[in-house]
Every structure is written in C-alpha cells, then in structure tokens.
Amino acid sequence: SPVPFGPEGRLEDKLHKPKATQTEVKPSVRFNLRTSKDPEHEGCYLSVGHSQPLEDCSFNMTAKTFFIIHGWTMSGIFENWLHKLVSALHTREKDANVVVVDWLPLAHQLYTDAVNNTRVVGHSIARMLDWLQEKDDFSLGNVHLIGYSLGAHVAGYAGNFVKGTVGRITGLDPAGPMFEGADIHKRLSPDDADFVDVLHTYTRSFGLSIGIQMPVGHIDIYPNGGDFQPGCGLNDVLGSIAYGTITEVVKCEHERAVHLFVDSLVNQDKPSFAFQCTDSNRFKKGICLSCRKNRCNSIGYNAKKMRNKRNSKMYLKTRAGMPFRVYHYQMKIHVFSYKNMGEIEPTFYVTLYGTNADSQTLPLEIVERIEQNATNTFLVYTEEDLGDLLKIQLTWEGASQSWYNLWKEFRSYLSQPRNPGRELNIRRIRVKSGETQRKLTFCTEDPENTSISPGRELWFRKCRDGWRMKNETSPTVELP
C-alpha cells in the first residue's frame, strides 16, 4: 500500500480531496528577516520597494543572506525545524541576514495546488532579490537559498527567474511527487545557482517516494543510501512517542535532511564526509572511499563548491542523532581458499582496536557473495574516533541466525550428510580510512594459522611493511 504522509492521512487522499471552502486567500508571500536568535521574536517583514525596514532592522548589505524556504504544510503553521535552522545559521554566521520565506497560505493547500504555487513563490523571491540587487553593496553571490521539500523546487524557480546567478542553493530532501523525472526548468537543477548541493534522505524505489530520487544538483548526497535513516525506524519512533506511526517515520526521515544541515552548522568540528559512488550498493560494498579528484566532500553547509559536468552522487553513513558523523573504513579481505562452503554465506563480524578506542562488534555486510581466490571489499563504520588502528578481530558467527540460513544448512546437510567443516583462509586485511585516507595492512598474528571456521575468530595485527600504494599516500581531505 502507498506510504502514508503526514498526520492527516495519505498523500494520495490529499491529491484528490475537494478543497474546503475558506476565506479568500491572498496569493501572498512574506519575507521575514529574523532579527533575533529568540525564536519568539516577530522579526521584520521586508517588502519590495520599501527600504525603511532594511534600515530599521539593520539589514547588512555586504553580509551573506540566507533565504529559508519551507515546503508543503498540512497545518498552516511553521514546522519546528525552521527555528532550529534559523538559530543554527545565526550561531554560525553572526553577521548574516536570515530571511524566512513565508508562503504558508500557498503551501497550506492540496499537494497538487501547492506544487502549482511553487512557480509564483519562486517569482516572488526573484523579485525580492532583483530589488535588493539595486541597492549598493548587495551581491547575489552572497545569497544562499535553503529549501526544504517543496521549498527546494521553489528555490530552483527563484534561481531560474532572478536576474543574474545566486551563489548557492541547498536542497534539503527536495520533494519527489510531481517532480521526479521532470524537465530541468520545472524542478531544482544545477543551472539554478552557481553551486547547488542536495541532501536526499527519504527516497524510496517502492511505493511513494516523498523525496526526489534523481540527482538534481552539482552534488547530490544520499546519507545512508538516501532511504532508511538510523533512529527513524518504527521501533525508534515508538520509543519517543506513545503511538509510533508510519507517519512519524516518514517525517523523521524526510526532516533528517534539515538536521544534517543544522549539524553541519553547529558541529563544525565534527564534519561528515560523503564519497562519490555510482550507486548505493557499490558504496555498501566499501568500494567508494576515495578522495582523489574531488571524489569526497563535506556535507551540508561546509560542502566545497564542485561544479562537475555531470551530477555527482555521493554517499555516507551517519549516526542516529547529532553529531551525525561516523568514521568509514574500507576493508579488503583476500580469501585465498575456501572449503566446503555449501550454499550459505558466512556471517562475519569485526572488532577494530585503536589507539583512542575500540569499536563495537561490527557486522560485515555481504552485498552479493564471498568470492573465492579474490579480494572481497566491505564497508564498516564506527561512531567513535578509534585513532590509529592497532589490531582487528575477525569472527565467523557460529549458529545461523536466520530461519532461511537454517533451512539452507539443513538442505545442505541432506545432500551432503558427511559434509566436513566449512573453512576459509585469510592471510591479511587491508584497511583504508575514509576520513584520513590512510591505508594499512593487517596480517594474521600467527602466519601459520590463517584459517577461520564457524564459531571461530582470527586476530590480525599491523603488518611490518604496512601498505602503501602509489599516488594515494596523502589524504586530500583536510580535517579541522
């Protein structure tokens, strides 16, 4: 069944429900300059052609100017994320102008009507920007439009309609319905600003994708594959509210884009890095942890401007809450012999031991299958900074954890009742840190003992020679 959307029911219902009769709606867009960090402050309303509020409210013509653009609303009130974002921008950029684009009356409609209103709202923002450009010292290059959901496409229209080019547009989980696959002039696209960066947190290949799946910026970042966000599962939501609903999960995942952006503003010292990759599966395999040729970038506010000829899809893993940063590791395990493997894939776990801390027991996700006489690549990530890695414990889980594996094992036993013990031989594990780009090789503690079987473990220590490959010794990412 389709994914429900919002506390008032399914998005599909909203698309076709007849409009309730109401007072005549002014097609109004308001620009609220948030003059105080106090969220209760009413701020200053700016309007084209009226210069007095700019003076009265100390609009800084030479500073950065942020326009925050909300999305579709079912309640007609600002959602709570807005104040967090305003506050975070004020904290990070003390002299900046933070303007909230209030298009609530046009967004508090059936979804289809709100979509049809995005163009007119984009026009209003462009008119405001054109007027501001008439003022001395105001530069479009200092303008950063930040749009959430439907607001991301509003930002796209604004960037398209304005005379000149805005400095940056950030799309926070741009809306999917009615925009997926649309012409570039009818959605957010790279030509709408000098730099367009996008965070995708609620994309779905089945059912209704609330966020757009296709890349729409210069860089498109898909945290946790752009779909299932940690801390947003039904169980997590059930923990925080009395009745966990799919609606809450949808909201949590869609809104995660905002929180990742806020995190990048307030936790500058803990930047999250994303890595260029052709797709989520390849990233899950650990293949894409390179920073060569601009293949990695900070996410959110700290993203470095990249104007690629084609869209750049980037991936990362995150924690369930702020600070979202994790530490990514690529693990290359060369399996040089294989004994009586049967049909079932082994379940491996690793524990990483470092100079700062030790990791928890981490599963090695087998995306396809373990290849024999080949190097198998895995992605693991830790929530804490382990420092320099010292040793690795590799464990092959004993008893099967799934009914499916138990059945396969039983079937395997029926066909080969005297099946001797299953075994793999592994001599070394190569590890690359995504965050530092450092590479190390770990060898078995006992060179004579390289075999591992179910319920057993193997210990690896840093090999004496280490592991270096040409041209990849120095990290291209600068960490603070």
Epitope: K26, N80, I241
Partner: antibody, heavy 120, light 111 residues
Framework: QVQLVQSGSELKKPGASVKVSCKAS????????MNWVRQAPGQGLEWMGW????????TYAGDFKGRFVFSLDTSVSTAYLQISSLKAEDTAVYYC?????????????WGKGTTVTVSS | DIQLTQSPSSLSASVGDRVTITCKAS??????????MHWYQQKPGKAPKLLIY???NLASGVPSRFSGSGSGTDFTFTISSLQPEDIATYYC?????????FGGGTKVEIK
C-alpha cells in the same frame, strides 16, 4: 500596551446567529495569528481554531467545522467569530488569543472573553 | 491529538505552602532541546494568563514563586510559596503540533 478587546455579552435564541469581535491594539495585527478558545460553564479550555491574520486563511479544529466562521477586517485590526444555527450547548465564554507565527506558539495575550448564552 | 492529563484536579493548601501540579502528555512534546509545554493561570471570571512558556521560562511580569520543569511527556508546575492571590485554576498546554490542547485544569484553593 498590547491588548485584545472583545465585544460584550450576547443572549441569543436557538437557531439564531452571533458575531463576536476581537479588536487588537499595541502591535502589528498581521504579525500574529488569532486563535479562538471556548470555555463552557464550569469546564476547561477548548481550542476552536485560528486565522492567519495576513492571508485570512482560517483553520478549524475538528468539532468546530461547519457552523463556525473566523474572519477579519485588517483595516481595523479586528478578528471575528461568527456562530450560526446556535444551540444550547454553544453557551460558553469565547476568548480570542494571539500567538506568534514563530517560536513555540504559546498564547501570550488574551481577550477578556465574550459570554454567549443560548436560551429559548 | 495529544492528550494532556493534569493532576490533581483540585487541591487545597495553606498560605506559604509549596504547591506542585503535574501534567502528563500522551506523547512527547519536545522538539530537539525545546519543550512545547506552557502553563496558564485563570482566576474566577477572568481570562487565562500565560505564566510559564517552554516548560520552564517565566513570562514577563510573572512573580518568581512560579516555576516549571520537565521534558518529554512529564511536566511539573510549582508555586514555591502559595499566596492568597494565587487562588485560580491552572492549565497546561502543548503547542508542539496543531491542534494545541489544554489539560483539564487544577483548581487551587486556600485552606
């Protein structure tokens, strides 16, 4: 100072209509939403809904859809509550209360209330 | 809708006593570090008046004997030293989402 001045008490017969006014002063009327709250005799507070004072878009709580209408006259900074087809159970004190569009949306300023009595 | 359960529904205390009222929400009314829970005082025949906003912030002009605390689903309102002019009904309210809802009220009387 900031205040909301409501119209006086009303005594109405069942089936009639009533229009309660709430005049704002001391602040920019369109910068705050206007809410309506009902309090039946001896009962608690019940939110009826609110009106966006800039756009004129009203939002009604579940039990107040149909016979209740919120409207505005921004030229005189006044919000109105109209109840049609009055019933005995509409007997209550009706309050207007403002809330900010931003922040935590509490009701920081209230009118003194208008008592509406419906009796045959 | 979020239900708010206030307790006790009424209480009688002496002047100078410490009075505590609790309000329990059917789901969390926190967003990040903010609590969208507020407290109002309504004296007989008068309109409600905001006392505490965002769980623990004293509204302008409100005496410091009034205080609030709590987060998530459990909140407390306290009068540190009850005064004769504090005879009223006190209501909690959540505004984390629309519709905003009120607790059933706690009537405070002097012994």
């Amino acid at each position: 100072q900031v205040q909301l001045v409501q119209s006086g008490s009303e005594l109405k017969k069942p089936g009639a209509s009533v229009k309660v006014s709430c005049k704002a002063s001391g602040y920019t009327f369109t910068n705050y939403g206007m809410n309506w709250v009902r309090q039946a005799p001896g009962q608690g507070l019940e939110w009826m809904g609110w009106i966006n004072t800039y756009s004129g878009v009203p939002t009604y709580a579940g039990d107040f859809k149909g016979r209740f209408v919120f409207s505005l006259d921004t030229s005189v900074s006044t919000a109105y509550l109209q109840i049609s087809s009055l019933k005995a159970e509409d007997t209550a004190v009706y309050y207007c209360a403002r809330r900010g569009y931003y922040g935590r949306r509490y009701f920081d300023v209230w009118g003194k209330g208008t008592t509406v009595t419906v009796s045959s | 809708d979020i239900q708010l359960t206030q307790s006790p529904s009424s209480l009688s205390a002496s002047v100078g006593d410490r009075v505590t009222i609790t309000c329990k929400a059917s789901q969390s009314v926190d967003y990040d570090v903010d609590s969208y829970m507020h407290w109002y005082q309504q004296k007989p025949g008068k309109a409600p008046k905001l006392l505490i906003y965002a769980a623990s912030n004293l509204a302008s002009g409100v005496p410091s004997r009034f205080s609030g605390s709590g987060s998530g689903t459990d909140f407390t309102f306290t009068i540190s030293s009850l005064q004769p002019e504090d005879i009223a009904t006190y209501y909690c309210q959540q505004t984390i989402e629309d519709p905003p809802t009120f607790g059933g009220g706690t009537k405070v009387e002097i012994k």
